[in-house]
Protein backbone atom coordinates (compact mmCIF):
# COMPACT_ATOMS: atom_id res chain seq x y z
CA UNK A 1 0.00 0.00 0.00
CA UNK A 2 1.76 3.11 -1.09
CA UNK A 3 1.00 6.04 1.17
CA UNK A 4 1.57 9.28 -0.64
CA UNK A 5 1.49 12.33 1.56
CA UNK A 6 1.54 15.80 0.12
CA UNK A 7 4.14 18.02 1.76
CA UNK A 8 3.88 21.76 1.21
CA UNK A 9 6.73 23.08 -0.88
CA UNK A 10 9.47 24.87 1.03
CA UNK A 11 9.26 28.54 0.12
CA UNK A 12 12.22 30.92 0.56
CA UNK A 13 11.96 32.80 3.86
CA UNK A 14 11.16 36.48 3.91
CA UNK A 15 13.51 39.06 5.43
CA UNK A 16 13.47 39.61 9.16
CA UNK A 17 12.98 37.32 12.12
CA UNK A 18 9.37 36.43 11.43
CA UNK A 19 10.07 35.82 7.78
CA UNK A 20 13.17 33.74 8.34
CA UNK A 21 11.72 31.56 11.04
CA UNK A 22 8.01 31.75 10.29
CA UNK A 23 7.88 29.68 7.13
CA UNK A 24 10.40 27.15 8.34
CA UNK A 25 8.60 26.59 11.61
CA UNK A 26 5.30 26.33 9.77
CA UNK A 27 6.68 23.79 7.33
CA UNK A 28 8.49 21.69 9.92
CA UNK A 29 5.36 20.47 11.75
CA UNK A 30 3.92 19.35 8.42
CA UNK A 31 7.07 17.47 7.52
CA UNK A 32 7.21 15.88 10.98
CA UNK A 33 3.54 14.99 10.82
CA UNK A 34 3.98 13.39 7.42
CA UNK A 35 6.94 11.35 8.64
CA UNK A 36 5.10 10.34 11.81
CA UNK A 37 2.04 9.23 9.88
CA UNK A 38 4.12 7.17 7.48
CA UNK A 39 6.36 5.69 10.17
CA UNK A 40 3.82 2.96 10.89
CA UNK A 41 3.42 1.89 7.27
CA UNK A 42 3.42 -1.90 6.99
CA UNK A 43 6.59 -3.49 5.68
CA UNK A 44 7.61 -6.97 4.65
CA UNK A 45 11.05 -8.42 5.34
CA UNK A 46 12.63 -11.40 3.64
CA UNK A 47 15.63 -13.42 4.77
CA UNK A 48 17.24 -16.12 2.62
CA UNK A 49 19.76 -18.53 4.07
CA UNK A 50 21.68 -21.36 2.45
CA UNK A 51 22.27 -24.32 4.73
CA UNK A 52 25.92 -25.16 5.33
CA UNK A 53 25.20 -28.87 5.42
CA UNK A 54 23.30 -29.09 2.14
CA UNK A 55 24.33 -26.58 -0.49
CA UNK A 56 21.08 -26.98 -2.38
CA UNK A 57 18.96 -26.40 0.71
CA UNK A 58 17.55 -22.96 1.46
CA UNK A 59 15.58 -21.50 4.33
CA UNK A 60 13.39 -18.51 3.54
CA UNK A 61 11.94 -16.48 6.37
CA UNK A 62 9.46 -13.67 5.85
CA UNK A 63 7.64 -11.37 8.18
CA UNK A 64 5.06 -8.63 8.16
CA UNK A 65 5.73 -5.47 10.15
CA UNK A 66 2.24 -4.12 10.45
CA UNK A 67 -0.77 -4.09 12.71
CA UNK A 68 -3.28 -5.64 10.31
CA UNK A 69 -4.25 -9.29 10.40
CA UNK A 70 -2.89 -11.55 7.68
CA UNK A 71 -5.36 -13.45 5.53
CA UNK A 72 -2.88 -15.22 3.23
CA UNK A 73 0.88 -15.49 2.64
CA UNK A 74 2.28 -16.52 -0.74
CA UNK A 75 5.93 -17.49 -1.18
CA UNK A 76 7.28 -17.63 -4.72
CA UNK A 77 10.60 -17.77 -6.52
CA UNK A 78 11.87 -16.36 -9.76
CA UNK A 79 10.14 -13.04 -9.08
CA UNK A 80 6.89 -11.78 -7.61
CA UNK A 81 3.94 -14.14 -7.88
CA UNK A 82 2.06 -12.02 -10.40
CA UNK A 83 5.10 -11.36 -12.58
CA UNK A 84 6.26 -14.75 -13.67
CA UNK A 85 7.25 -16.14 -10.30
CA UNK A 86 6.46 -19.72 -9.38
CA UNK A 87 4.51 -20.34 -6.19
CA UNK A 88 6.27 -22.50 -3.62
CA UNK A 89 3.83 -22.29 -0.73
CA UNK A 90 0.62 -20.61 0.34
CA UNK A 91 -0.16 -20.25 4.04
CA UNK A 92 -3.55 -19.45 5.51
CA UNK A 93 -3.70 -18.57 9.21
CA UNK A 94 -6.70 -20.80 9.89
CA UNK A 95 -7.21 -23.16 6.98
CA UNK A 96 -3.71 -24.52 6.69
CA UNK A 97 -0.73 -24.67 4.38
CA UNK A 98 -0.22 -25.76 0.80
CA UNK A 99 3.24 -26.31 -0.63
CA UNK A 100 4.81 -27.62 -3.81
CA UNK A 101 8.19 -29.14 -4.64
CA UNK A 102 10.92 -28.22 -3.95
CA UNK A 103 9.35 -26.76 -0.80
CA UNK A 104 9.93 -29.24 2.01
CA UNK A 105 8.35 -27.55 5.02
CA UNK A 106 6.40 -24.34 5.28
CA UNK A 107 5.19 -23.17 8.67
CA UNK A 108 4.09 -20.20 10.71
CA UNK A 109 6.74 -18.94 13.10
CA UNK A 110 4.62 -16.22 14.68
CA UNK A 111 1.30 -14.59 13.82
CA UNK A 112 3.10 -12.40 11.32
CA UNK A 113 6.09 -14.41 10.14
CA UNK A 114 6.62 -17.65 8.27
CA UNK A 115 9.48 -19.90 7.28
CA UNK A 116 9.96 -22.20 4.34
CA UNK A 117 12.62 -24.87 3.88
CA UNK A 118 13.51 -25.70 0.30
CA UNK A 119 15.49 -28.71 -0.73
CA UNK A 120 16.51 -29.28 -4.28
CA UNK A 121 18.22 -31.87 -6.36
CA UNK A 122 18.69 -31.65 -10.07
CA UNK A 123 16.22 -29.62 -12.07
CA UNK A 124 14.23 -28.31 -9.15
CA UNK A 125 17.11 -27.09 -7.01
CA UNK A 126 17.34 -23.35 -6.44
CA UNK A 127 20.54 -21.46 -7.20
CA UNK A 128 22.35 -18.99 -5.01
CA UNK A 129 21.06 -16.02 -6.97
CA UNK A 130 17.43 -17.10 -7.13
CA UNK A 131 15.01 -14.41 -5.99
CA UNK A 132 12.44 -15.38 -3.39
CA UNK A 133 9.37 -13.25 -2.80
CA UNK A 134 6.85 -13.15 0.01
CA UNK A 135 3.46 -11.56 -0.33
CA UNK A 136 1.31 -10.87 2.71
CA UNK A 137 -2.33 -10.28 1.94
CA UNK A 138 -4.84 -8.73 4.30
CA UNK A 139 -8.15 -8.94 2.48
CA UNK A 140 -9.61 -6.49 1.62
CA UNK A 141 -7.25 -3.89 3.09
CA UNK A 142 -4.25 -4.53 0.90
CA UNK A 143 -1.25 -6.71 0.14
CA UNK A 144 2.46 -6.16 0.60
CA UNK A 145 5.29 -7.96 -1.14
CA UNK A 146 9.07 -8.04 -0.77
CA UNK A 147 11.78 -10.10 -2.42
CA UNK A 148 15.24 -11.19 -1.42
CA UNK A 149 18.08 -13.45 -2.47
CA UNK A 150 21.45 -14.59 -1.21
CA UNK A 151 24.23 -12.09 -1.85
CA UNK A 152 26.48 -13.40 -4.67
CA UNK A 153 29.50 -13.61 -2.39
CA UNK A 154 27.84 -15.25 0.59
CA UNK A 155 29.36 -18.43 1.94
CA UNK A 156 27.21 -21.47 2.69
CA UNK A 157 25.80 -21.30 6.15
CA UNK A 158 25.70 -17.56 6.15
CA UNK A 159 22.39 -15.86 5.84
CA UNK A 160 21.52 -12.90 3.72
CA UNK A 161 20.55 -9.94 5.86
CA UNK A 162 16.80 -9.65 6.05
CA UNK A 163 15.27 -7.02 3.85
CA UNK A 164 14.78 -4.73 5.74
CA UNK A 165 17.75 -5.64 7.93
CA UNK A 166 16.33 -5.14 11.42
CA UNK A 167 13.59 -7.64 12.21
CA UNK A 168 11.53 -5.54 14.58
CA UNK A 169 8.04 -5.93 15.87
CA UNK A 170 5.75 -3.50 14.10
CA UNK A 171 4.73 -1.58 17.22
CA UNK A 172 8.34 -1.23 18.33
CA UNK A 173 9.36 -0.10 14.86
CA UNK A 174 6.61 2.49 14.90
CA UNK A 175 7.60 3.81 18.32
CA UNK A 176 11.27 3.98 17.41
CA UNK A 177 10.45 5.61 14.10
CA UNK A 178 8.27 8.30 15.65
CA UNK A 179 10.74 8.91 18.48
CA UNK A 180 13.59 9.25 16.02
CA UNK A 181 11.64 11.64 13.85
CA UNK A 182 10.64 13.79 16.83
CA UNK A 183 14.21 13.81 18.14
CA UNK A 184 15.47 14.80 14.72
CA UNK A 185 12.83 17.54 14.59
CA UNK A 186 13.89 18.97 17.94
CA UNK A 187 17.56 18.92 17.00
CA UNK A 188 16.75 20.57 13.70
CA UNK A 189 14.72 23.30 15.41
CA UNK A 190 17.57 23.98 17.85
CA UNK A 191 19.97 24.10 14.93
CA UNK A 192 17.78 26.64 13.16
CA UNK A 193 17.50 28.77 16.26
CA UNK A 194 21.26 28.73 16.83
CA UNK A 195 21.96 29.54 13.21
CA UNK A 196 19.52 32.40 13.30
CA UNK A 197 21.09 33.80 16.48
CA UNK A 198 24.54 33.90 14.91
CA UNK A 199 23.55 35.17 11.48
CA UNK A 200 21.44 38.09 10.34
CA UNK A 201 18.47 37.08 8.22
CA UNK A 202 19.45 37.08 4.55
CA UNK A 203 17.59 39.36 2.19
CA UNK A 204 16.31 37.23 -0.60
CA UNK A 205 14.94 38.20 -3.95
CA UNK A 206 11.32 37.27 -4.55
CA UNK A 207 10.92 33.73 -5.78
CA UNK A 208 10.96 33.36 -9.53
CA UNK A 209 9.11 30.10 -9.38
CA UNK A 210 5.51 29.93 -10.45
CA UNK A 211 2.92 30.46 -7.73
CA UNK A 212 1.95 26.83 -8.05
CA UNK A 213 5.27 25.47 -6.86
CA UNK A 214 5.80 21.75 -7.34
CA UNK A 215 4.92 19.79 -4.26
CA UNK A 216 7.44 17.52 -2.61
CA UNK A 217 6.23 13.95 -2.37
CA UNK A 218 6.94 11.83 0.66
CA UNK A 219 6.69 8.11 0.23
CA UNK A 220 6.19 5.90 3.20
CA UNK A 221 8.86 5.45 4.34
CA UNK A 222 11.01 8.09 2.70
CA UNK A 223 12.96 7.04 -0.33
CA UNK A 224 16.20 7.47 1.59
CA UNK A 225 15.11 5.06 4.29
CA UNK A 226 13.62 2.85 1.61
CA UNK A 227 17.02 2.50 0.02
CA UNK A 228 18.57 1.73 3.39
CA UNK A 229 15.97 -0.83 4.34
CA UNK A 230 15.42 -2.77 1.16
CA UNK A 231 17.53 -4.75 -1.21
CA UNK A 232 16.11 -4.20 -4.69
CA UNK A 233 14.76 -7.16 -6.58
CA UNK A 234 17.79 -9.19 -7.51
CA UNK A 235 18.53 -10.45 -10.98
CA UNK A 236 16.48 -13.49 -11.79
CA UNK A 237 18.29 -16.49 -13.17
CA UNK A 238 15.45 -18.29 -14.86
CA UNK A 239 17.55 -21.36 -15.48
CA UNK A 240 17.34 -22.06 -11.76
CA UNK A 241 13.60 -22.31 -11.79
CA UNK A 242 12.03 -25.74 -11.50
CA UNK A 243 11.55 -27.61 -14.73
CA UNK A 244 9.13 -29.99 -13.08
CA UNK A 245 6.50 -27.40 -12.23
CA UNK A 246 3.92 -25.81 -14.47
CA UNK A 247 5.29 -22.31 -14.22
CA UNK A 248 3.66 -19.02 -15.03
CA UNK A 249 5.12 -18.97 -18.57
CA UNK A 250 6.98 -15.68 -18.35
CA UNK A 251 7.06 -13.70 -21.55
CA UNK A 252 8.82 -10.56 -20.55
CA UNK A 253 6.23 -9.13 -18.25
CA UNK A 254 5.97 -5.52 -17.24
CA UNK A 255 9.33 -3.82 -16.92
CA UNK A 256 8.15 -1.65 -14.06
CA UNK A 257 7.69 -4.31 -11.40
CA UNK A 258 11.35 -4.24 -10.44
CA UNK A 259 11.14 -0.60 -9.47
CA UNK A 260 8.14 -0.91 -7.20
CA UNK A 261 8.90 -0.23 -3.54
CA UNK A 262 8.65 -3.45 -1.61
CA UNK A 263 6.11 -2.05 0.79
CA UNK A 264 3.77 -0.94 -1.94
CA UNK A 265 0.44 -2.66 -1.81
CA UNK A 266 -1.13 -4.06 -4.90
CA UNK A 267 -4.60 -3.09 -3.82
CA UNK A 268 -6.08 0.11 -2.49
CA UNK A 269 -6.98 0.28 1.15
CA UNK A 270 -10.50 -0.80 1.92
CA UNK A 271 -12.58 -0.88 5.07
CA UNK A 272 -11.08 -2.70 8.01
CA UNK A 273 -12.53 -6.14 7.99
CA UNK A 274 -10.83 -8.97 9.74
CA UNK A 275 -10.11 -9.13 13.42
CA UNK A 276 -6.88 -10.81 14.36
CA UNK A 277 -7.19 -14.55 14.14
CA UNK A 278 -5.21 -16.98 16.26
CA UNK A 279 -2.54 -18.90 14.43
CA UNK A 280 -2.85 -22.64 14.97
CA UNK A 281 -0.11 -24.62 16.64
CA UNK A 282 2.97 -25.02 14.52
CA UNK A 283 3.15 -27.87 12.10
CA UNK A 284 2.27 -28.61 8.54
CA UNK A 285 -1.36 -28.72 7.54
CA UNK A 286 -0.58 -30.23 4.16
CA UNK A 287 -1.69 -33.69 5.23
CA UNK A 288 -4.86 -32.28 6.74
CA UNK A 289 -5.63 -30.40 3.53
CA UNK A 290 -5.02 -33.48 1.40
CA UNK A 291 -7.08 -35.51 3.84
CA UNK A 292 -10.04 -33.23 3.28
CA UNK A 293 -9.94 -34.00 -0.42
CA UNK A 294 -9.43 -37.68 0.27
CA UNK A 295 -12.55 -37.75 2.46
CA UNK A 296 -14.50 -36.18 -0.35
CA UNK A 297 -13.37 -38.97 -2.64
CA UNK A 298 -11.09 -36.86 -4.78
CA UNK A 299 -7.44 -36.02 -4.94
CA UNK A 300 -6.17 -32.52 -4.26
CA UNK A 301 -7.02 -30.19 -7.12
CA UNK A 302 -3.44 -30.00 -8.34
CA UNK A 303 0.05 -31.06 -7.59
CA UNK A 304 1.68 -27.84 -8.63
CA UNK A 305 0.81 -24.19 -8.89
CA UNK A 306 0.09 -22.31 -12.03
CA UNK A 307 -3.24 -23.75 -13.05
CA UNK A 308 -5.61 -22.12 -15.45
CA UNK A 309 -8.45 -20.09 -14.03
CA UNK A 310 -9.81 -19.40 -17.49
CA UNK A 311 -9.16 -22.68 -19.31
CA UNK A 312 -8.49 -22.59 -23.00
CA UNK A 313 -10.19 -25.24 -25.15
CA UNK A 314 -7.00 -25.56 -27.21
CA UNK A 315 -5.18 -27.11 -24.30
CA UNK A 316 -3.17 -26.16 -21.19
CA UNK A 317 -0.24 -24.60 -23.04
CA UNK A 318 -2.33 -22.50 -25.40
CA UNK A 319 -2.38 -19.54 -23.09
CA UNK A 320 0.17 -17.24 -21.55
CA UNK A 321 -0.37 -17.62 -17.86
CA UNK A 322 -2.90 -19.27 -15.63
CA UNK A 323 -5.48 -16.52 -15.85
CA UNK A 324 -5.46 -16.80 -19.55
CA UNK A 325 -4.17 -13.25 -19.74
CA UNK A 326 -2.00 -12.90 -22.82
Amino acid sequence: MRTEAQVPALQPPEPGLEGAMGHRTLVLPWVLLTLCVTAGTPEVWVQVRMEATELSSFTIRCGFLGSGSISLVTVSWGGPNGAGGTTLAVLHPERGIRQWAPARQARWETQSSISLILEGSGASSPCANTTFCCKFASFPEGSWEACGSLPPSSDPGLSAPPTPAPILRADLAGILGVSGVLLFGCVYLLHLLRRHKHRPAPRLQPSRTSPQAPRARAWAPSQASQAALHVPYATINTSCRPATLDTAHPHGGPSWWASLPTHAAHRPQGPAAWASTPIPARGSFVSVENGLYAQAGERPPHTGPGLTLFPDPRGPRAMEGPLGVR
Epitope: G82, L309, G321
Partner: nanobody, 121 residues
Protein backbone atom coordinates in the same frame (compact mmCIF):
# COMPACT_ATOMS: atom_id res chain seq x y z
CA UNK B 1 0.68 -8.35 -11.87
CA UNK B 2 -2.94 -9.35 -12.19
CA UNK B 3 -5.48 -6.57 -12.13
CA UNK B 4 -9.09 -7.33 -11.32
CA UNK B 5 -11.62 -4.62 -12.09
CA UNK B 6 -15.24 -4.93 -10.98
CA UNK B 7 -18.21 -3.15 -12.51
CA UNK B 8 -22.00 -3.37 -12.53
CA UNK B 9 -22.79 -2.27 -9.00
CA UNK B 10 -25.42 0.30 -8.21
CA UNK B 11 -28.71 1.04 -6.50
CA UNK B 12 -31.55 -1.41 -7.01
CA UNK B 13 -34.95 -2.01 -5.42
CA UNK B 14 -35.69 -5.14 -3.38
CA UNK B 15 -36.57 -7.99 -5.70
CA UNK B 16 -34.52 -6.45 -8.50
CA UNK B 17 -31.51 -7.80 -10.37
CA UNK B 18 -27.92 -6.77 -11.05
CA UNK B 19 -25.08 -8.34 -12.99
CA UNK B 20 -21.56 -7.77 -11.72
CA UNK B 21 -18.58 -8.17 -14.04
CA UNK B 22 -14.90 -8.66 -13.26
CA UNK B 23 -12.27 -8.15 -15.93
CA UNK B 24 -8.90 -9.78 -15.37
CA UNK B 25 -5.88 -8.24 -17.02
CA UNK B 26 -2.16 -8.02 -16.48
CA UNK B 27 0.52 -10.60 -16.44
CA UNK B 28 -0.32 -13.99 -15.00
CA UNK B 29 -1.73 -15.59 -11.92
CA UNK B 30 -0.97 -18.90 -10.31
CA UNK B 31 -3.96 -19.34 -8.01
CA UNK B 32 -6.59 -22.03 -8.46
CA UNK B 33 -9.90 -20.31 -7.73
CA UNK B 34 -11.83 -17.12 -8.32
CA UNK B 35 -14.91 -15.72 -6.74
CA UNK B 36 -17.04 -12.92 -5.38
CA UNK B 37 -16.75 -11.79 -1.78
CA UNK B 38 -18.70 -9.07 -0.02
CA UNK B 39 -18.49 -6.80 2.96
CA UNK B 40 -21.64 -5.23 4.35
CA UNK B 41 -21.41 -1.82 6.05
CA UNK B 42 -20.27 -2.16 9.64
CA UNK B 43 -19.81 -5.91 9.29
CA UNK B 44 -16.96 -8.30 8.70
CA UNK B 45 -16.08 -9.83 5.40
CA UNK B 46 -18.34 -12.66 4.21
CA UNK B 47 -16.87 -15.95 3.14
CA UNK B 48 -17.07 -16.39 -0.60
CA UNK B 49 -20.52 -15.38 -1.81
CA UNK B 50 -19.86 -17.44 -4.94
CA UNK B 51 -16.61 -19.10 -5.99
CA UNK B 52 -15.39 -21.29 -8.81
CA UNK B 53 -12.22 -23.35 -8.99
CA UNK B 54 -10.06 -24.58 -11.84
CA UNK B 55 -12.02 -27.79 -12.13
CA UNK B 56 -15.21 -25.78 -12.56
CA UNK B 57 -16.59 -26.61 -9.12
CA UNK B 58 -18.92 -23.86 -7.97
CA UNK B 59 -19.74 -23.01 -4.38
CA UNK B 60 -22.37 -20.56 -3.08
CA UNK B 61 -22.96 -19.13 0.36
CA UNK B 62 -26.22 -20.43 1.85
CA UNK B 63 -27.67 -16.93 1.93
CA UNK B 64 -27.48 -16.55 -1.86
CA UNK B 65 -28.23 -20.06 -3.10
CA UNK B 66 -30.91 -20.06 -5.78
CA UNK B 67 -30.63 -16.30 -6.26
CA UNK B 68 -27.04 -15.69 -7.39
CA UNK B 69 -25.22 -17.33 -10.29
CA UNK B 70 -21.48 -17.19 -10.92
CA UNK B 71 -20.08 -17.70 -14.42
CA UNK B 72 -16.95 -16.99 -16.38
CA UNK B 73 -16.08 -16.20 -19.96
CA UNK B 74 -12.70 -17.70 -20.76
CA UNK B 75 -12.34 -15.86 -24.04
CA UNK B 76 -12.82 -12.50 -22.33
CA UNK B 77 -10.94 -13.38 -19.12
CA UNK B 78 -14.00 -12.28 -17.20
CA UNK B 79 -15.95 -13.41 -14.18
CA UNK B 80 -19.62 -12.56 -13.61
CA UNK B 81 -22.16 -12.62 -10.83
CA UNK B 82 -25.83 -12.54 -11.75
CA UNK B 83 -27.81 -11.41 -8.71
CA UNK B 84 -31.57 -11.91 -8.74
CA UNK B 85 -34.28 -11.39 -6.11
CA UNK B 86 -32.04 -8.94 -4.28
CA UNK B 87 -32.72 -8.20 -0.62
CA UNK B 88 -31.75 -5.34 1.66
CA UNK B 89 -29.24 -7.63 3.38
CA UNK B 90 -27.38 -8.04 0.09
CA UNK B 91 -26.24 -4.41 0.37
CA UNK B 92 -22.45 -4.51 0.49
CA UNK B 93 -19.22 -3.82 -1.34
CA UNK B 94 -18.62 -6.76 -3.67
CA UNK B 95 -15.05 -7.81 -4.43
CA UNK B 96 -13.86 -9.98 -7.28
CA UNK B 97 -10.90 -12.05 -6.10
CA UNK B 98 -8.50 -14.72 -7.30
CA UNK B 99 -6.84 -17.00 -4.82
CA UNK B 100 -6.15 -20.44 -3.48
CA UNK B 101 -8.45 -23.23 -2.35
CA UNK B 102 -8.15 -24.40 1.25
CA UNK B 103 -10.50 -27.11 2.43
CA UNK B 104 -12.84 -26.38 -0.46
CA UNK B 105 -12.95 -22.65 0.25
CA UNK B 106 -11.36 -19.97 -1.91
CA UNK B 107 -9.00 -17.65 -0.03
CA UNK B 108 -8.24 -14.35 -1.83
CA UNK B 109 -4.69 -13.50 -2.84
CA UNK B 110 -5.50 -10.76 -5.36
CA UNK B 111 -8.62 -8.68 -5.64
CA UNK B 112 -10.18 -5.60 -7.14
CA UNK B 113 -11.17 -2.34 -5.54
CA UNK B 114 -14.78 -3.46 -5.07
CA UNK B 115 -18.13 -2.30 -6.41
CA UNK B 116 -20.95 -1.03 -4.22
CA UNK B 117 -24.33 -2.74 -4.38
CA UNK B 118 -27.19 -1.03 -2.56
CA UNK B 119 -30.60 -2.65 -2.26
CA UNK B 120 -33.13 -0.12 -1.05
CA UNK B 121 -36.64 1.01 -1.80
Amino acid sequence: EVQLVESGGGLVQPGGSLRLSCAASGYSYSGDCMGWFRQAPGKGLDEGVATIDNAGRIKYADSVKGRFTISRDNAKNSLYLQMNSLRAEDTAVYYCAAGWTFGGQCSPADWGQGTQVTVSS
